[in-house]
């Protein structure tokens, strides 16, 4: 093989990837916002409500600081594989319940998706640890009732708000270490 | 322009050692992980060895763990690659690349044969 | 034996489309990892033709497309050129390897 013609630059930087997962992140924050604007709107809740198979928060924003790179970004992508699952049951399982809330649920999953292939190709551009999901958990029960399924509704929107927040401030700061 | 330059190949014998390494420019070396691709004459081509953008992460193909090791220098922004203990079954073009990876240099030939 | 299977060649007349298939298992593609694809014209380096499924780099005519369903992936090339005549690999991160892995590539003829 002769000395190289050099190449084009094909694909994104990954620092201007970081900036873009920051946006698509942001986005999809304020979508979930939204969502949980309406649903509360729609079917009040009474106090915080919670879902066993939800992950736990990944971090408070003050302890941010000590992370590194590979652990924000294999955590944030084990925790938005299992709301996506989520997401995906909440659709599945309310279907006519949540009707009104449809367009946009369905808004959110495909974004969500996106984001979780935005993740996947800055851990492999950095070839940072592509660490396997955790095992598949066993498949999510129906809700017992109608009102069963608009409480972990709000669980999902609403964990997935603190995770996401969470996300868009460990990304920043991660960015000024690339 | 992107750049990826090989160098350090050539003939060596069986049990030898050869150390290769790769020079890259035009783009920021220091954010993308590192790779080494082989591919025997006629063949496919077989990853051997990854490094976190950092260096704090290295995988190898399990044909070369124990004899090969990967490195980088982001202050020179050149890759690395030591093989030691070299194998007939080793003989290939060994490319360097970058990122998923997204570029790549144009190869060295290492011949290993007595 | 390759991790990720590919039809050893291709063909097709120019015009048409052709399609190259990539079969992984549940610990490459089918674990949400991205496929690539690359393009190795005879006589020199691989090139990214396909990154994270469906996605091109630049320079990259819209001639060539991914797509990814469940362990498996594809790579279509429509109005076929004879400068398209390559090898072509597929990629993706393997969970039980710890470490990328290449299909055994696919020799396109254009005829």
């Known amino acids: 093989p002769g000395p190289p013609p050099g190449s084009p630059r094909a694909s994104p930087d990954p620092r201007a990837e970081l900036d873009s997962t920051v946006l698509l992140t942001r986005s999809l924050l304020e979508d979930t916002r939204q969502l949980t604007i309406q649903l509360k709107d729609k079917f009040p809740a009474d106090g915080d409500h919670n879902l066993d198979s939800l992950p736990t928060l990944a971090m408070s924003a003050g302890a941010l600081g000590a992370l590194q790179l590979p652990s924000v970004l294999t955590r944030l992508r084990a925790d938005l594989l299992s709301y996506l699952r989520h997401v995906q049951w909440l659709r599945r399982a309310m279907g006519s319940s949540l009707k009104t809330l449809e367009p946009e649920l369905g808004t959110l999953q495909t974004r969500l998706d996106r984001l979780l292939r935005r993740l996947q190709l800055l851990m492999s551009r950095l070839a940072l640890p592509q660490l396997p999901p955790d095992p598949p958990a066993p498949p999510l029960a129906p809700p017992s009732s109608t009102w069963g399924g608009i409480r972990a509704a709000h669980a999902i929107l609403g964990g997935l708000h603190l995770t996401l927040d969470w996300a868009v401030r460990g990304l920043l700061l991660l960015k000024t270490r690339l | 322009e992107v750049q990826l330059l090989e160098s350090g190949g050539g003939l060596v014998q069986p049990g030898g050692s050869l150390r290769l390494s790769c020079a890259a420019s035009?783009?920021?070396?220091?954010?993308?992980?590192g790779h080494w691709v082989r591919q025997a004459p006629g063949k496919g081509l077989e990853w051997v060895a990854v490094?976190?953008?950092?260096?704090?992460?290295?995988y190898y193909a399990d044909s070369v763990k124990g004899r090969f090791t990967i490195s980088r220098d982001n202050s020179k922004n050149t890759l690395y690659l030591q093989m030691n203990s070299l194998r007939a079954e080793d003989t290939a073009v060994y490319y360097c690349a970058a990122g998923v990876p997204d570029y790549w240099g144009q190869g060295t030939l290492v011949t290993v044969s007595s | 034996q390759s991790v990720l299977t590919q039809p050893p060649s291709a063909s097709g007349t120019p015009g048409q489309r052709v399609t190259i298939s990539c079969s992984g298992s549940?610990?490459?593609?089918?674990?949400?990892?991205?496929v690539h694809w690359y393009q190795q014209l005879p006589g020199t380096a691989p090139k990214l033709l396909i990154y994270s499924n469906e996605e091109r780099p630049s320079g990259v005519p819209d001639r060539f497309s991914g797509s990814k369903s469940g362990t498996s992936a594809s790579l279509a090339i429509s109005g076929l050129r004879s400068e398209d005549e390559a090898d072509y690999y597929c990629?993706?991160?393997?969970?039980?390897?710890?470490?990328?892995?290449f299909g055994g590539g696919t020799k396109l003829t254009v005829l």
């Open positions: 990629a993706a991160w393997d969970d039980s390897l710890s470490g990328p892995v």
């Open positions: 035009g783009f920021t070396f220091s954010s993308y992980g």
């Open positions: 549940s610990s490459n593609i089918g674990s949400y990892y991205d």
């Open positions: 490094i976190s953008y950092d260096g704090s992460y290295k």
